[in-house]
Interface confidence: low
């Protein structure tokens, strides 16, 4: 009750805390090795607080340091598919606007079939990320396995 | 400037905070897939502040969207012997309410001793959260090396 | 009680939100196996906001739960050459001041290159962070491969 | 309860600029649960999505109208405008202001709409 | 854009009987599908959104089926009050598109 009283005043969204959580909705098509996302409750258990997504790419909508965390694991694998595949490589990092580009956060699979990590990184307003799989590979589309995410963490 | 004035009506614990930081605690018995986990000062660095433990498992009071982690070692563990007794796959899934039952975040060890992964997701006041560890290799007890968290995000 | 009072003078700031992201400056000498950071805009990406760094280590400057995450990419490596120099093995502890001295995060890489994790740990003022990668392999200095943070999370 | 009201001139000339706006009550424009959308309907014809802003103000637009369109929002007011420039007859429709929810329920539809105001371009 | 093409353009049915309304999409919505109800004068209503959830008082007689590109809207047994237009939406990419409409009219 007295949280809500408060509201009144101050919504709780002007304290800025953007969130999201996305699940792999495809890959691109050849020679775009960007993974395009998907997000929202009918979905499953992604959502889309403040961010946005703009082709399955996710765009800020605040200034601030955030949380970005990813998982991928790759579909019909086993250590021997991932070694005989490598390098396959995920790399998190901003693709627009072009003079901000940079990559924030990558990993290699060599023999492991999953890949997981976070960081904590400035964003700004229109920004947007682009998570990059390279190599021959396919990532598993199932919402337990692979999914992304970035998490508004202060000013 | 209106933040501290909302502060005024409203003090942090009612921002919901809730989190907590569990150690594995034991096995099941067989057939029963299960970690069970242990929290509080007394033991060690782990705690509880708004979840409690339910027979071993977590559960959430509070409604949100929470940021679940988790790290999982094998004992007794090399590359050669995470492969032999592939798989063994750890699964966190939402195990009560069964009418929410559901997979959240979900790895193999393939050939590797640990995983470690994190997520964000929305979580309601009496879910209970299950880690099911599936396969022949049993789980270092050693506080630094497993681990399982959720930290409140936002309503 | 108290902290609501307190809330009621002080700005967002007091909340605490204390945060850092470091990127890796260097290695020890021979028989020093810790990691030395570095941080600041000027780097890149990496910044201090509350916590310091001391001789490369990071200081802790308010009390309460944080997240600590770390991800640390050996050079020059594959999945043979992990194997070959294994156990190279990451630790995340309090190594300062001594009475407080405890491993808070440990992970080996076998037959990977990258190690990635992330906990939720009670640190006090004062309390230094160490990082300490034992083994004959060095670590990637790309700031996209090798990262440590912390972030506030409540007291 | 949550209601939309849109308000503005029911005649506007040709290549003028149509001004539309949308009061909000029962609810705060400023959450991120909400979209604030502006659809229209020619008469006797089908929906079109014009746009839609957020708390943050940031904005998506059909890409059929976005040369000519602008969506606003004064939170201090509890509102939000549509501006369309350079209008012709085939502008002529009913517009209409819908929220969309994005919070847990109902994702990206229109759950609740304004009553509608008929817009005629003629001179 | 994706474009959204609902059948038949009018439909004539009895008091009572079943109606049963399409929606094509020309790419894969998954679920992101929503049905609105449209009377004369009126704004339109949110029947059904995610292809097949029942808005908030919605009766039960009202049901979605479909993913992907083939949707469904029934109506179990058509009241007076259910004579409207029916509208399909996409939310699954933008811009956000309607369908032209289904006229459900007395027989």
């Known amino acids: 009750q007295r949280f809500a009283q408060a509201q009144q005043q101050l919504p709780l969204e002007s304290l800025g805390w953007d969130v999201a959580e996305l699940q792999l909705n495809h890959t691109g098509p050849q020679q775009d090795p960007r993974l395009y996302w998907q997000g929202g409750p009918a979905l499953g258990r992604s959502f889309l607080h403040g961010p946005e997504l703009d082709k399955g790419q996710l765009r800020i909508h605040r200034d601030g340091i955030y949380m970005v965390h990813i998982q991928v694991t790759l579909a019909i694998c086993s250590s021997t598919t991932a070694s005989r595949h490598h390098p396959t490589t995920l790399a998190v990092g901003i693709c627009s606007p072009a003079s901000r580009s940079i990559s924030l956060l990558r990993l290699s699979f060599h023999q492991g079939c999953t890949i997981a990590s976070q960081r904590l990184t400035p964003l700004a307003r229109g920004d947007t990320l682009c998570t990059n799989l390279t190599g021959t590979l396919l990532p598993s589309r199932n919402t337990d396995e692979t999914f992304f995410g970035v998490q508004w963490v202060r000013p | 400037q209106r933040f501290a004035q909302a502060q005024q009506q409203l003090p942090l614990e009612s921002l919901g905070w809730d989190v907590a930081e569990l150690q594995l605690n034991h096995t099941g018995p067989q057939q029963d897939p299960r970690l069970y986990w242990q929290g509080g000062p007394a033991l060690g660095r782990s705690f509880l502040h708004g979840p409690e433990l339910d027979k071993g498992q977590l559960r959430i009071h509070r409604d949100g969207i929470y940021m679940v982690h988790i790290q999982v070692t094998l004992a007794i563990c090399s590359s050669t012997t995470a492969s032999r007794h592939h798989p063994t796959t750890l699964a966190v899934g939402i195990c009560s309410p069964a009418s929410r039952s559901i997979s959240l975040l979900r790895l193999s060890f393939h050939q590797g001793c640990t995983i470690a992964s994190q997520r964000l997701t929305p979580l309601a006041r009496g879910d209970t959260l299950c880690t099911n560890l599936t396969g022949t290799l049993l789980p270092s007890r050693n506080t630094d090396e497993t681990f399982f968290g959720v930290q409140w995000v936002r309503p | 009680q108290r902290f609501a009072q307190a809330q009621q003078q002080l700005p967002l700031e007091s909340l605490g939100w204390d945060v850092a992201e470091l990127q890796l400056n260097h290695t020890g000498p021979q028989q020093d196996p810790r990691l030395y950071w570095q941080g600041g805009p000027a780097l890149g990406r990496s910044f201090l906001h509350g916590p310091e760094l001391d001789k490369g280590q990071l200081r802790i400057h308010r009390d309460g739960i944080y997240m600590v995450h770390i991800q640390v990419t050996l050079a020059i490596c594959s999945s043979t050459t992990a194997s070959r120099h294994h156990p190279t093995t990451l630790a995340v502890g309090i190594c300062s001041p001594a009475s407080r001295s405890i491993s808070l995060l440990r992970l080996s890489f076998h037959q990977g290159c990258t190690i990635a994790s992330q906990r939720l740990t009670p640190l006090a003022r004062g309390d230094t962070l160490c990082t300490n990668l034992t083994g004959t392999l060095l670590p990637s200095r790309n700031t996209d491969e090798t990262f440590f943070g912390v972030q506030w999370v409540r007291p | 309860q949550l209601q939309l009201q849109e308000s503005g001139p029911g005649l506007v000339k040709p290549s003028e600029t149509l001004s539309l706006t949308c009061t909000v009550s029962?609810?705060?424009?400023?959450?991120?649960?909400?979209?604030w959308n502006w659809i229209r309907q020619p008469p006797g014809k089908g929906l079109e999505w014009i746009g839609r802003?957020?708390?943050?103000?940031?904005?998506y637009y059909n890409p059929s109208l976005k040369s000519r369109v602008t969506i606003s929002v004064d939170t201090s007011k509890n509102q939000f405008s549509l501006k369309l420039s350079s209008v012709t007859a085939t502008d002529t429709a009913v517009y209409y202001c819908?929220?969309?929810?994005?919070?847990?329920?109902?994702?990206?539809?229109?759950?609740?709409w304004g009553q509608g105001t008929m817009v005629t371009v003629s001179s | 854009e994706i474009v959204m093409t609902q059948s038949p353009a009018t439909l004539s049915v009895s008091p009572g009987e079943r109606a049963t309304l399409s929606c094509r999409a020309s790419?894969?919505?998954?679920?992101?599908l929503a049905w609105y109800q449209q009377k004369p004068a009126q704004a339109p209503r949110l029947l059904i959104y995610?292809?097949?959830t029942r808005a908030t008082g919605i009766p039960a007689r009202f049901s979605g089926s479909g993913s992907g590109t083939e949707f469904t809207l029934t109506i179990s047994s058509l009241q007076s009050e259910d004579f409207a237009v029916y509208y399909c939406?996409?939310?699954?990419?933008?811009?956000?598109?309607f369908g032209g409409g289904t006229k459900v009219e007395i027989k």
């Open positions: 819908a929220r969309q929810i994005r919070y847990n329920w109902n994702p990206d539809t229109f759950d609740i």
């Open positions: 029962g609810a705060s424009i400023t959450s991120t649960s909400y979209y």
């Open positions: 802003i957020s708390y943050s103000g940031s904005t």
């Open positions: 790419q894969s919505l998954n679920s992101n």
């Open positions: 995610g292809a097949s």
């Open positions: 939406q996409q939310y699954d990419n933008w811009p956000l598109t």
